[in-house]
């Protein structure tokens, strides 16, 4: 039922991904389905706004971290990728695309530089970055 998928370009070690649609999904073709979420890692570098538009065009959003347990595969992600977290200057908060405020329980934010967008890195870390900097990105679609 479970396949040990080793996606060398994405993860630091072996990740368990279910084989059968009945356990997870449905997801767009070639996306990763894991615990009722669909994920796709895009290799082309885009700025945050272009990354958001790319996800939206596929009926998805940029990555939202909402549960360490449900999203434990993210612990092993390699490199840095845009996620759907932005600083809203009008109220000073860091919010997800859906307007919810980031909980410090879910991500440790590291302020390497000034910026209004954030990159996801392994072990539930978020790195602040200038939104216009090109980076790879992760799209996510909830299946439930």
């Amino acid at each position: 039922i479970w396949s040990a998928v080793f996606l060398n370009s994405l993860f630091n070690q072996e990740v368990q991904i279910p084989l059968t649609e009945s356990y997870c999904g449905p997801c767009p073709k070639n996306w990763i389905c894991y615990k009722n979420n669909c994920y796709q890692f895009f290799d082309e570098s885009k700025n945050w706004y272009e990354s958001q538009a790319s996800c939206m065009s596929q009926n998805a959003s940029l990555l939202k971290v909402y549960s360490k347990e449900d999203q434990d595969l993210l612990k092993l992600v390699k490199s840095y990728h845009w996620m759907g977290l932005v600083h809203i200057p009008t109220n000073g908060s860091w919010q997800w695309e859906d307007g919810s405020i980031l909980s410090p329980n879910l991500l440790t934010i590291i302020e390497m530089q000034k910026g209004d967008c954030a990159l996801y890195a392994s072990s539930f870390k978020g790195y602040i970055e200038n939104c216009s900097t090109p980076n790879t990105y992760i799209c996510m679609q909830r299946t439930v």
């Epitope: 549960s67 360490k68 410090p104 934010i109």
Partner: antibody, heavy 117, light 107 residues
Amino acid sequence: QVQLQQSGAELVRPGASVKLSCKASGYTFTSYWMNWVQQRPEQGLEWIGRIDPYDSETHYNQKFKDKAILTVDKSASTAYMQLSSLTSEDSAVYYCAKMGDYSFDYWGQGTTVTVSS
Amino acid sequence: DIQLTQSPASLSASVGETVTITCRASGNIHNYLAWYQQKQGKSPQVLVYNAKTLADGVPSRFSGSGSGTQYSLKINSLQPEDFGSYYCQHFWSTTWTFGGGTKLEIK
């Protein structure tokens, strides 16, 4: 309901170590950071550090980096803090506190540590 | 690490008065600030989180405000049960610190 039950008062000799415990119940232990806070007599609150029960990641106040070690036992839903090389300066009430979504929403009752010869 | 400077350190006021306690951060903490009340011999209790959101069960005479590096807690029409110590705390980045505290006493 959420409860954090801390271990009892400790009287320890200078130079010794002590291990305090904080037993959590009423919530998913691995979903929230556990924090430890020091309050010396007639003084304010000082954040010692935090541990993520999910993967045991820790962050410490630099001041306590060589003083405190935070650990958890996930199977027992219990957080621990070991204090070493104790001096009279370490005599204080120590609290564990659960990080809610945006604040320390639940606190233990506190453990009094007295360092005296 | 970001430090929090709380003022005043102590304050005397009468029942019915309005008081304001301020908390200044050494860097932008993006509204990740909470306020706590502590009574003698008791554990602290949260009053306000995200700088301005009142915690469950907290009377509406308490209010939080501010952004960036400047925050404040206002208590309207002080009640006898409001006397005690107040602390601000931030949750930005990796190390989370408390302000030095404000002791609110009855005049």
